[in-house]
Amino acid sequence: AGVFELQIHSFGPGPGPGAPRSPCSARLPCRLFFRVCLKPGLSEEAAESPCALGAALSARGPVYTEQPGAPAPDLPLPDGLLQVPFRDAWPGTFSFIIETWREELGDQIGGPAWSLLARVAGRRRLAAGGPWARDIQRAGAWELRFSYRARCEPPAVGTACTRLCRPRSAPSRCGPGLRPCAPLEDECEAPLVCRAGCSPEHGFCEQPGECRCLEGWTGPLCTVPVSTSSCLSPRGPSSATTGCLVPGPGPCDGNPCANGGSCSETPRSFECTCPRGFYGLRCEVSGVTCADGPCFNGGLCVGGADPDSAYICHCPPGFQGSNCEKRVDRCSLQPCRNGGLCLDLGHALRCRCRAGFAGPRCEHDLDDCAGRACANGGTCVEGGGAHRCSCALGFGGRDCRERADPCAARPCAHGGRCYAHFSGLVCACAPGYMGARCEFPVHPDGASALPAAPPGLRPGDPQRYL
């Protein structure tokens, strides 16, 4: 066991042209924070894949407000280290992702808005217990400078934090076959005792009492070979004994056994092995007391001292049913975003995303505008998984290719006549009305209702609307 430590030194514009705009403004002050994600090995995994070695979030940095006209400086950073504890051995080679996040502190509805400013990733070799390693990474126009190290937590030592050290029992020397623990010369290496019976050829341990298998072996003591040849038959042996995947439908698919019964296939059909207190072909019959342990998923049994008196299961959060055998419908909270469909699989929630969205909760809006062009000076607007063009004046249609008729909406009031014009539209007002859209009546004495007609225009003149 040990800790990976990350120290951010600076985050700011990188060298070269094209300095990034400051992420904060006087109108929207903000502050930075960082997230680190670690994965073992030299994996080229996507950012969304699990951080198997661990992850950490920094504190928020000081609030920063841009000074108008000043170039974006190095931004104020959070105090302290980012620490990622690891429970098992340090793998020696690892992949990292460091994300710089901006928290806007304006008065948004629902609290601060977060946005990802930069993400850097890399693959490194690093021995635990070594000195700080320095690094510089660039993401677009931003540059991140940082240092990192891995250190073991006592009593673990070594480059992988797998050797254990204990204080010496005798002042002069360590026991037979045990070396002094460098750099703690006053301590001795402790023997690592694996789980009893763990195969010495095919198993190993990094923590006392465990048994981890080398590739090609499985089972609690690593004594069972993972066979591939026996998997070739249409329904080969079960995965528990061989490590094979069992394809194809079978009578136990969907588990027909109720009340936590386990299903095993027979030559003709299936057989249920029922838990205590249940019987019947599908374990559907109960003559149960609390002594039989009828409550599943950690439910608490109350009453039911004898088979004739009823028992009640008080279910833990997330479960319900007379035996706590049913999961609560977690999808009713609608965790999927952007119209995604929620599926409660029991062990996890899944979201089936609509076109244009991705991510575990459909939170990523795919770039609808990528490769799409809006004609005649229109700009592409993302949203809802389908691109939309915001067209320049005088153009319309899906891609702004059609000339818009500015008179189509009948913009001239009080019977005024509309004329299309290269810069917009012109209204020729009916007698008694004036204004850009003929919206103002002219009083009989020649005075107009507010606002007054611009100088040089008589009430009957066409008004150009720009």
Partner: nanobody, 120 residues
Framework: EVQLVESGGGEVQPGGSLRLSCAAS????????MGWYRQAPGKQRELVAG???????KYAESVKGRFTISRDNAKNTVYLQMSSLRAEDTAVYYC??????????????WGQGTLVTVKP
């Protein structure tokens, strides 16, 4: 690991009010959806009110106009203000949250529940 800690339950007379709080703590990157479920004896657990993944609020028909859900993002806390309470609101109220962890994974968590009893 993430913990949800509820408070504010108790006994109240019909027509009375209570305010429940639920604070989330632990390895949280962000809270995607969070709300309150309740379970009355012998009944299925049902959603009472919640903030969905899209940030909108959702209420059970039976509590609309009487219960209000609110949140404090800075404290990772949601509140349920319950007014005009009725006998049929008696239940164990559970806080629930769909959380994005520091590892980027999403997990669904439950609180231990707080008992609300409405009786004359």
């Amino acid at each position: 690991e993430v913990q949800l800690v509820e408070s504010g339950g108790g006994e109240v007379q019909p027509g009375g009010s209570l305010r429940l709080s639920c604070a989330a703590s632990g390895s949280i990157f962000s809270i995607n959806a969070m709300g309150w479920y309740r379970q009355a004896p012998g009944k299925q657990r049902e959603l009472v009110a919640g903030f969905t993944g899209d940030g909108s609020t959702k209420y059970a028909e039976s509590v609309k106009g009487r219960f209000t859900i609110s949140r404090d993002n800075a404290k990772n806390t949601v509140y349920l203000q319950m007014s005009s309470l009725r006998a049929e609101d008696t239940a164990v109220y559970y806080c629930a949250a769909d959380v994005q962890l520091l590892t980027s994974d999403y997990e669904f968590y439950w609180g231990q529940g707080t008992l609300v009893t409405v009786k004359p």
